[in-house]
Interface confidence: low
């Protein structure tokens, strides 16, 4: 009877969906070893946790291959939803842009956000600012307390996509005029 119980028990475990792809499986903890090429994933549900053998790791995890057993390891990249490896994100959390395997709330300098894919792409490259120009107002350099001075920069490289705007290439700021009153 004991043998029959063991045999039935094993058969029922093998047919249990949580034991799919397992090399060893228990009623309480699910899989503890997986068939070759599958990834071991420790799923948590409330206070309970059990092992599963998966063809691909769930969102937020990546497949880590090792001689003893392939495992699903958690993405440790900040604001990452799914990743290819421990330091390369493939999809960021909502509101973040993917750039070279990392997630940014704003694209780094020289890159522009592509909202449809939430990626940072090669942006518009601009040169250095010129010196501030002469302080003037309405083409005069006198007569006011305050004027505007302007500086400019050149576009060095056009952006990867036409829809990506270039940063401002001219900016002005208020400046104190050297002469309040115009001579003569």
């Amino acid at each position: 009877q004991g043998n029959r119980w063991r045999r039935n028990k094993r058969a029922s475990y093998v047919s249990n969906p949580i034991c799919k792809g397992c090399l060893s499986c228990s009623k309480d903890n699910g899989c503890s070893r997986c068939q070759q090429k599958l990834f071991f994933f420790l799923r948590r549900e409330g206070m309970r946790q059990y092992g599963e053998c998966l063809h691909s790791c769930p969102s937020g995890y990546y497949g880590h291959r090792a001689p003893d057993m392939n495992r699903c390891a958690r993405c440790r990249i900040e604001n990452c939803d799914s990743c290819f490896s421990k330091d390369f994100c493939t999809k960021c959390k909502v509101g973040f842009y993917l750039h070279r395997g990392r997630c940014f709330d704003e694209c780094p300098d020289g890159f522009a956000p592509l909202d449809e894919t939430m990626e940072c792409v090669e942006g518009c490259e601009v040169g250095h600012w010129s010196e501030w120009g002469t302080c003037s107002r309405n083409n005069r350099t006198c007569g006011f307390k305050w004027g505007l001075e302007t500086r400019t920069r050149q576009i060095v490289k056009k952006p990867a996509k036409d829809t990506i705007p270039c940063p401002t290439i001219a900016e002005s700021r208020r400046c104190k005029m050297a002469m309040r009153h115009c001579p003569g």
Epitope: R137, N138, G143, F144, K145, W146, L148, P167, T168, E171, S172, R173, R174, H181, C182
Partner: antibody, heavy 119, light 110 residues
Framework: EVQLVESGGGLVKPEGSLKLSCVAS????????MSWVRQAPGQGLEWVAH??????????YYSGSVKGRFSISRDDSRNMVYLQMNNLRTEDTATYYC??????????WGQGTQVTVSS | QPVLTQSPSVSASLGASVKLTCTLS???????IEWYQQHPDKSPKFLMQ??????SKGDGTPDRFSGSSSGAHRYLSISNLQLEDEAIYYC?????????FGSGTQLTLL
Amino acid sequence: EVQLVESGGGLVKPEGSLKLSCVASGFTFSDYFMSWVRQAPGQGLEWVAHIYTKTYNYATYYSGSVKGRFSISRDDSRNMVYLQMNNLRTEDTATYYCTTDEDWYFDFWGQGTQVTVSS
Amino acid sequence: QPVLTQSPSVSASLGASVKLTCTLSSQHSTNYIEWYQQHPDKSPKFLMQVRDGSHSKGDGTPDRFSGSSSGAHRYLSISNLQLEDEAIYYCGLSDVSLYLFGSGTQLTLL
């Protein structure tokens, strides 16, 4: 003490005209740029028009919403600034403030005069 | 994108401090701005002009009010809030031949 007192507001029909006046005291009026700023009921502030001093040939500037319909002028001998408003629209309904314009900002304000454009 | 962006309302407690923000669009991010205060049914009052790292106040603006700047953001800080500080605060900016106002922030004291 700087004082600005507006007058000339009232009820006018659409496409009608109105001339606002502002008398200034307590400062050398001829040295100051002057502006009109308005505020529609329950809304924010909107700059309307600006006039320079004689030194700058009384140059004038207008916001896009009033350009071609409103005209700002001044009379330095009487310490007065005016806003002639023609072809008035319902959206011109607002309190109109006369302001001293230190250098493209408004450091003193009058109490305002109400303009209502309605049929 | 508006040239000047202000949050519609801010609440703070009597005696506390508050920092109001005016955000400039990218093409105006280096401009000076002005802050104005308006009490209900009263004329606006000029508070100060905020420049890069400094400000110049209007006559009668209390010491409790100060201005500062960071990137495209301009701030109006009010410390030790008093009942009379409950008002709408507008930022404004001159752009050579026109003047633009923000939509205003209603400061409510709790």
